[in-house]
Amino acid sequence: AMDLILINSLPLVSDAETSLTCIASGWRPHEPITIGRDFEALMNQHQDPLEVTQDVTREWAKKVVWKREKASKINGAYFCEGRVRGEAIRIRTMKMRQQASFLPATLTMTVDKGDNVNISFKKVLIKEEDAVIYKNGSFIHSVPRHEVPDILEVHLPHAQPQDAGVYSARYIGGNLFTSAFTRLIVRRCEAQKWGPECNHLCTACMNNGVCHEDTGECICPPGFMGRTCEKACELHTFGRTCKERCSGQEGCKSYVFCLPDPYGCSCATGWKGLQCNEACHPGFYGPDCKLRCSCNNGEMCDRFQGCLCSPGWQGLQCEREGIPRMTPKIVDLPDHIEVNSGKFNPICKASGWPLPTNEEMTLVKPDGTVLHPKDFNHTDHFSVAIFTIHRILPPDSGVWVCSVNTVAGMVEKPFNISVKVLPKPLNAPNVIDTGHNFAVINISSEPYFGDGPIKSKKLLYKPVNHYEAWQHIQVTNEIVTLNYLEPRTEYELCVQLVRRGEGGEGHPGPVRRFTTASIGLPPPRGLNLLPKSQTTLNLTWQPIFPSSEDDFYVEVERRSVQKSDQQNIKVPGNLTSVLLNNLHPREQYVVRARVNTKAQGEWSEDLTAWTLSDILPPQPENIKISNITHSSAVISWTILDGYSISSITIRYKVQGKNEDQHVDVKIKNATITQYQLKGLEPETAYQVDIFAENNIGSSNPAFSHELVTLPESQAPADLGGGKMLL
């Protein structure tokens, strides 16, 4: 609602500073507030443009300040105008010289159509001149010099709307500078009536409130509020919701308040006089001290608020029993709220007595739109109104107002809403790698459109052409692996960013499509890898019988352990072996195989093998003879890997016997590293030699080993570890 207030301080201009302040209280005008000279009311006033400035103490207020040296240019009529949603509201006021020859009884006077009216001016300077009275700058009446009374009056026995206007009085030899002004406001309707045809009945406007002839609403005096102006504001406050405050040391002293017609101008409650600098006499209160306290039960009369009722009593005269009314208070509403665009459910919470009802709580958007609660509940102490805005957008940012209007009074609390744009990635995620059941994704969450900071990120995915809901995973890193995907399936991927606050999920970003690989066949069975020559290895496997009609082949990967040498070979699916050639002698190779169709199969376990040696094997090392008894002994050794050693020969003979009397023991399993010689003679010395054999030949022993068996009675020692052939 529009609440425009013009403060005229002071209307009687002397040599002191004087000002006009226009306040848009509790609403945000669509166009700037304007302050100007009211030439309609007074044509021949000063023409200088006004220096209008922003009132720094209030958000929506304009001010004109005249320094004392400008006193001569101030006399005249002024207006303040504000607009919201096509509706304009104009407030008028006047300023005149304190040294004028006459002074008006009041700055404005509001009467009903048909009233018997006397407009009066008090003579303050006596001159031997005729007195003249003007209306809106045009002469209407004169009084001969010898008949000029102390109170100069214009009598209107049946006031009509056309009688309204600015009346001025001066001596004939004077001018605008010495004129006194008063403005007569005539309500278009008779007393207690309103409406286009003036046949509606007004609500009672208490405390000198005025019934608006067009709407039937009460315009409340400064210091009172509510539908019927029954509720007194807190000390030194004013405005439709009493949220404006007089900053003077003595509150609203010396402030003349002008409100929209038909109210006109008056002092704030508790003050009277043309300059509003006189306190009310005891027993009187209200604007211009026009209201008389008639408090029941000897209650106190306060010049600002009227009767101060004891607990359990209420009403203007404390005439009604009941819990005293308490002005509503808005609670738990922060000054600033950050909101994500989309659905928004603001809450207004208020206390007071009686508790505000659903109908009494509203929310006003920055553009002036009034919202009503979608949901409402109350406890013993609070009413809670929940509003719904289905789609709040950044242009809705600004000052919103929670408004509560009950019989106990009205309160408004402005709060700032900042509507944020939900974030959305600009780019689709990138697919780095895929398999038959996984995909590695770079989510590409930046750059993004909209507002941060980003609280969390979701990767959304679903198979294309499936009527499935999107699945999602929360992600923290830019690179993420999606597991448990279906093979040979086209997927859609996108990223959703979430900013802080309720409803912070942004729209998903651009979509990327990718297809998982088909599921792989199992590796060949019965894989065997054996050396064939110094440069070849032979890999064999069992025949493959695929389950589908798809063509298939065997892929064999071989790599050298010693060198960075790798080769992949494709083998037709009907074969069961492959010769791996062009290898290096005496080199270890790792081989694995898989069966591929259009999709790659699963790799087998690694197989390792050495190519045959191109040199004689080295002699076995670490040869030890142990566990000697009267008839046996254990021989152990180690051999070096990689020489294609196929067997080990142990040769022994009794010392001193001929060479041809030796015994050869050939161990064909090269993995055996121990052997027990048996059937030896007691207390006999033996010469023992050991050789390694490979595809090239035998190793050359550098020296022989001696073994002496024990006498028959002696016990043997424990056997050593290692593989042993008995």
Epitope: G86, E87, Q192, K193, G195, P196, E197, N199, H200, L201, C202, T203, A204, M206, D214, T215, G216, E217, R227, T228, E230, G315, P354, E359, V407
Partner: antibody, heavy 117, light 113 residues
């Protein structure tokens, strides 16, 4: 909370009189103009009468002028409708309503008057 | 007296669909000096008193859902329910308060199709 409760309805013979009452609570009764509005069974709404907040001004619909009298007792927070010379066409549910700025913002639940011989 | 005429007398609309009720006054209820239309809309559910929905032809009363909207000027007015809900089944009345006697339209019964 604003409450309006009508009473005094019933069956009455044509030509007889009846007085309806409307008890108000939850607001300053003496500040508001009050109305009576009626609704014949199965028909639409018809405004009957209005009284100013202090009882000094009253208006009536032509159909009831001279027969019905609206009054109020602000000390008892009660609105009245004195209905004389009742006719069959006066049969209706009678609502009392609080007006602000031209509209009926609060209504009672209504009381049924049946005028029948 | 100003006569008020509503159309249609009854209306059946599917849930979620738009419902439109018209109201015509025998003379303009627009007051030129403040550019306001002195027209209100009420909803009356079965067995209940009427409830104020809209005043000044287009201002929603506190607590009225925003699916209800009023429009028009002069002598032709419309009440629109943008998306009909089950609880909107009722009789709807327009009323002029340009002058006394206050007069209502004959009502429009709104049902679900």
């Amino acid at each position: 909370q604003v409450q309006l409760v009508e009473s005094g309805g019933g069956v009455v013979q044509p030509g007889r009189s009846l007085r309806l009452s409307c008890a108000a609570s939850g607001f300053t009764f003496s500040s508001y103009a009050m109305h009576w509005v009626r609704q014949a069974p199965g028909k639409g709404l018809e405004w009957v009468a209005v009284i100013s907040y202090d009882g000094s001004n009253k208006y009536y619909a032509d159909s009831v002028k001279g027969r019905f009298t609206i009054s109020r007792d602000n000390s008892k927070n009660t609105l009245y409708l004195q209905m004389n010379s009742l006719r069959a066409e006066d049969t209706a549910v009678y609502y009392c309503a609080r007006q602000y700025s031209g509209v009926f913002e609060y209504w009672g639940q209504g009381t049924l008057i049946t005028v029948s011989s | 007296d100003i006569q008020m005429t509503q159309s249609p007398d009854s209306l059946a609309v599917s849930l979620g669909e738009r419902a439109t009720i018209n109201c015509k006054s025998s003379q303009s209820v627009l007051y030129r000096s403040n550019n306001r239309n002195y027209l209100a809309w009420y909803q009356q559910k079965l067995g209940q008193p009427p409830q104020l929905l809209i005043y000044w032809a287009s201002t929603r009363e506190s607590g009225v859902p925003d699916r209800f909207s009023g429009s028009g000027s002069g002598a032709d007015f419309t009440l629109t329910i943008s998306s009909l809900q089950a609880e909107d089944v009722a009789v709807y009345y327009c009323q002029q308060y340009f002058s006394i006697p206050y007069t209502f339209g004959q009502g429009t019964k709104l049902e679900i199709k």
